[in-house]
């Protein structure tokens, strides 16, 4: 997270760290007792590694009573996700067992009504991604509030030049932005999950290259079918 600040510890009990061989790889969001939603591209290079999900964490390194690392029983990328596009960049991870819920571990309601979030709406994005352009990784969860950007502006040639489909949304990126390592994390508007940070190699913090988020409402049928 660029231009953000340390989150209040455990105030986002839905927040997950998707880990590869014991190290933070991507963000994720607990959407059901046994399911974490993240980004499909996160697992592209994870073929031989051990993927796990950390829940109940604020610090990645320090012991915390609520922290628990779960093995992954099943990883379900969206069937239409492809390495070279930002489209359909969703991944559902089934935990080896139901998460132990409590004040620091709780699923987040996700948006089912397929309607665009109004431009200018302030949404919260959180993650353990890099916090500066030098690539410094934080130990504790960071967050930032970002205004939603209308899709037409996001599709301008000087922004994302037509790449933003109706299944994607954008948020402003003027110094405050999601960045590398935040992919798969939640964009939360009014207490509801609206978007998932896409995992392209986008430049961060440049206002002309807004953050791109997969709209979960557009994938409600797929999410329901996997969770069923």
């Amino acid at each position: 997270i660029l231009g953000g600040r340390e989150a209040e510890a455990h105030a986002r009990p839905y927040m997950a760290s998707v880990q590869l061989n014991g190290a933070h790889l991507c963000g994720g969001v607990l959407v059901a007792e046994q399911w974490v939603l993240s980004a499909a591209h996160c697992l592209e290079d994870a073929a031989d590694g051990k993927v796990q999900v950390l829940l109940g964490a604020h610090s990645l390194s320090q012991p915390e009573p609520s922290k628990r690392l779960y093995d992954v029983l099943r990883a379900v990328p969206h069937p239409d996700s492809q390495p070279d596009t930002i489209d359909h960049d969703l991944l559902l991870l089934q935990l080896s067992e139901k998460a132990t819920l409590g004040p620091a571990v709780r699923p987040l309601p996700w948006q089912r009504v397929d309607r665009d979030v109004a431009p200018g709406t302030l949404c919260d994005v959180a993650g353990w991604g890099i916090v500066n352009h030098a690539g410094r990784r934080p130990d504790s969860l960071q967050h930032v509030l970002l205004p939603v950007l209308d899709r037409a502006t996001c599709n301008r040639r000087t922004h994302h030049d037509g790449a933003i489909t109706e299944r994607l949304m954008c948020a402003e990126s003027n110094r405050r932005d999601s960045c590398k390592g935040d992919s798969g994390g939640p964009l939360v508007c009014g207490g509801v999950l609206e978007g998932v940070v896409t995992s392209g190699s986008r430049v961060c913090g440049n206002r002309k290259k807004p953050g791109i988020y997969t709209r979960v409402a557009s994938y409600a049928a797929w999410i329901d079918s996997v969770l069923a």
Partner: antibody, heavy 116, light 112 residues
Framework: EVQLVESGGGLVQPGGSLRLSCAAS????????MNWVRQAPGKGLEWIGD????????DYNADFKRRFTFSLDTSKSTAYLQMNSLRAEDTAVYYC?????????WGQGTLVTVSS | DIQLTQSPSSLSASVGDRVTITCRSS???????????LEWYQQKPGKAPNLLIY???NRFSGVPSRFSGSGSGTDFTLTISSLQPEDFATYYC?????????FGQGTKVEIK
Amino acid sequence: EVQLVESGGGLVQPGGSLRLSCAASGYQFTSYYMNWVRQAPGKGLEWIGDINPVTGDTDYNADFKRRFTFSLDTSKSTAYLQMNSLRAEDTAVYYCTREGPSFAYWGQGTLVTVSS
Amino acid sequence: DIQLTQSPSSLSASVGDRVTITCRSSQTIVHSNGDTYLEWYQQKPGKAPNLLIYKVSNRFSGVPSRFSGSGSGTDFTLTISSLQPEDFATYYCFQGSHVPVTFGQGTKVEIK
């Protein structure tokens, strides 16, 4: 399939007004800026300006700002170009073109002739 | 406003010829985001323009590989490696980096 269809062109007297329409189909109208470009007979392309279909924000080439106005009817997925105080030198084919990717999608153009 | 000057204004060539059109801008067209929004369009009589090249050197989908773009700063080039009968048209460069966006005056490619 993305389609842009202009209409409303024709013969108009100097000092008169005309409203051109650009009806869009095959995509979500509010997802892309609409631009207007004109081309005088035998001449090059000239950018008139653009409009954001979500916010209604506009940007005009300074040469057209006083006399030309953009508007929208999002329920009809249509953009409009209102032209006032027309002059002979406004005689041209007028195009609408969607921005994103680049100007990949254009209407067929509508001819406006300003003559007495 | 940024002016784009194309040269030549017109040229005569034969099928199979290599054709080069240049476009010079009155100032740099590198955008504040670091990208250069220099595009090339092809237009045939009575038709709307067609996008060929975007961001200096990227071919738009469906554009034949004989079309290529290059350049940087203020000097840009469109090259047609082997002219085909359907390539006889007028070509325009365009800059989208700075408002007002502007077109070059055009280069008409005619049959020799």
